[in-house]
Amino acid sequence: KKVVLGKKGDTVELTCTASQKKSIQFHWKNSNQIKILGNQGSFLTKGPSKLNDRADSRRSLWDQGNFPLIIKNLKIEDSDTYICEVEDQKEEVQLLVFGLTANSDTHLLQGQSLTLTLESPPGSSPSVQCRSPRGKNIQGGKTLSVSQLELQDSGTWTCTVLQNQKKVEFKIDIVVLAFQKASSIVYKKEGEQVEFSFPLAFTVEKLTGSGELWWQAERASSSKSWITFDLKNKEVSVKRVTQDPKLQMGKKLPLHLTLPQALPQYAGSGNLTLALEAKTGKLHQEVNLVVMRATQLQKNLTCEVWGPTSPKLMLSLKLENKEAKVSKREKAVWVLNPEAGMWQCLLSDSGQVLLESNIKVLPTWSTPVQP
């Protein structure tokens, strides 16, 4: 018996060939011997089967002795043995119809689980072999689960259902809802304007939800909510904002926040959360602010940084075009009785400058000038 695999919703064509290459009488029946379709001369006739409106044949092939049964919009329950009767012969074809679907929404939050469910006919014992967009293979039976979805899991999942050494292939598009970056650091000199951007790693027609930025300043004992906002069809509206600092927020995506001035008391780390409508759970992005200040008080030139810096970062003070006078893995460095000239305070990571602040030291009878 020939086995044919079909895909739920697709069209299948079951073949039946006579030895005579001419139009002769044929009919297709199901395993219950109920007639599906056949011919009367050059006319297609249909029987009382459940397939009535979805069954067809190709009249153009009858003259060649081919009498196919075409079933449109396949359903799992179409799985059956179909019998073609032609020239006193019976050709049997077993049709097995499978469906593979994501059991929840195909738009999932980062960290959530994806479950693919296989619909299969009774008595079948298929296996499912799926491949993620990043090339990872996963095998399963009736269900296949992937926990802790990552951003790289967004895209087309390709799956092969195997039964009786035959296969049927599926593709499922999955969107992992996440921010483009899990974390970011902004380095600013004291007094500069700070721009925080929170680009999303996905695009959808309508995006509705609400969000909040909580901030833990390095100098503060507890975190506080800096801003809350609503998102409606990709339009942003601020609900509540602290008075200090007075943040401003862009009205369109990507989510964009502006802090008028970088000050030591604001240095620290924040967590922006976004709750999307009809989704359980939230999207998160961490943002960090590092602030630098260079000052001269009497005979002491000091450079300080505030905020989350890693131990490998180097802070140094140097007179321009000269070797660094002081260079330490510390958050503050100073030089006593600095020479006159333009001094540079540098925060660097393996030689790459992350932040730079210049201060002009005048001869001792003058007061310093900050450019």
């Epitope: 491949r131 990872k136 895209g155 390709t158 292939e169 593709k171």
Partner: antibody, heavy 118, light 106 residues
């Protein structure tokens, strides 16, 4: 029977783009996964990438910026492009089929020897 | 990257011998381990896929086993035509290959 046949230049100059074609008979490239693998002179094997029945691609991360695989379903062919080649890319390039998605290459082309030299 | 180590780079055996080739993975590969035969004429053939499934047309003297990070290919009754280099390859993620084991006759 399934057959795969590689074609393209056997000599490529450094910094140029290597372009190879795999012609498939006996199966349709709109089903399964279609791969490129190369074999270095010492028999070391390296996976380059694949194109799937769904027209999705994946590449070896070490070559990602240089490699591209495309297909032409009307000709039942799929192509490999490797940019900015160096002498290190001298190898025998094979195309292969993975029918069921296990990365199990059940049919291989006989391979095409490519030398990168000025 | 998942690294595969074939502990023996070459081995000699006599006709009729039982030969086992070992392949170790740097992490659990969930049984996605395939074995290939590279003949001296350069032809590559799939022998075993998904640890123990025999590819169609491959003689039953070839078998595979293993789990986690340790896998093996066994030829139960060595024949002259089995002289070749054998490669393991993981298919858990984007494929990587072992360095190969060259099998010769004593």
């Amino acid at each position: 029977e399934v057959q795969l046949q590689e074609s393209g230049p056997s000599l490529v100059k450094p910094s140029q783009t290597l372009s190879l074609t795999c012609s498939v008979t006996g199966d349709s490239i709109t089903s399964g996964y279609w791969n490129w693998i190369r074999k270095f002179p010492g028999h070391k094997l390296e996976f380059l990438g694949y194109i799937s029945f769904a027209d999705t691609t994946n590449y070896n991360p070490s070559l990602k910026s240089r490699v591209s695989i495309t297909r032409d379903t009307s000709k039942n062919q799929f192509d490999l492009q490797l940019k900015s080649v160096t002498t290190e890319d001298t190898a025998t390039y094979h195309c292969a089929r993975d029918d069921y998605g296990y990365y199990a290459m059940d049919y291989w082309g006989q391979g095409i020897s490519v030398t990168v030299s000025s | 990257d998942i690294h595969l180590t074939q502990t023996t780079s070459s081995l000699s055996a006599s006709l009729g011998d039982r030969v086992t080739i070992i392949c170790r993975a740097s992490q659990d590969i969930d049984n996605y381990l395939n074995w290939y035969q590279l003949k001296p004429d350069g032809t590559l053939k799939l022998l075993i896929y998904y640890t123990s499934r025999l590819h169609s047309g491959v003689p039953s003297r070839f078998s595979g086993s293993g789990s986690g990070t340790e896998y093996s290919l066994t030829i139960s009754n060595l024949e002259r035509e089995d002289v070749a280099t054998y490669f393991c390859q993981q298919g858990n993620t984007l494929p990587t290959f072992g360095a190969g084991t060259k099998l010769e006759l004593k």
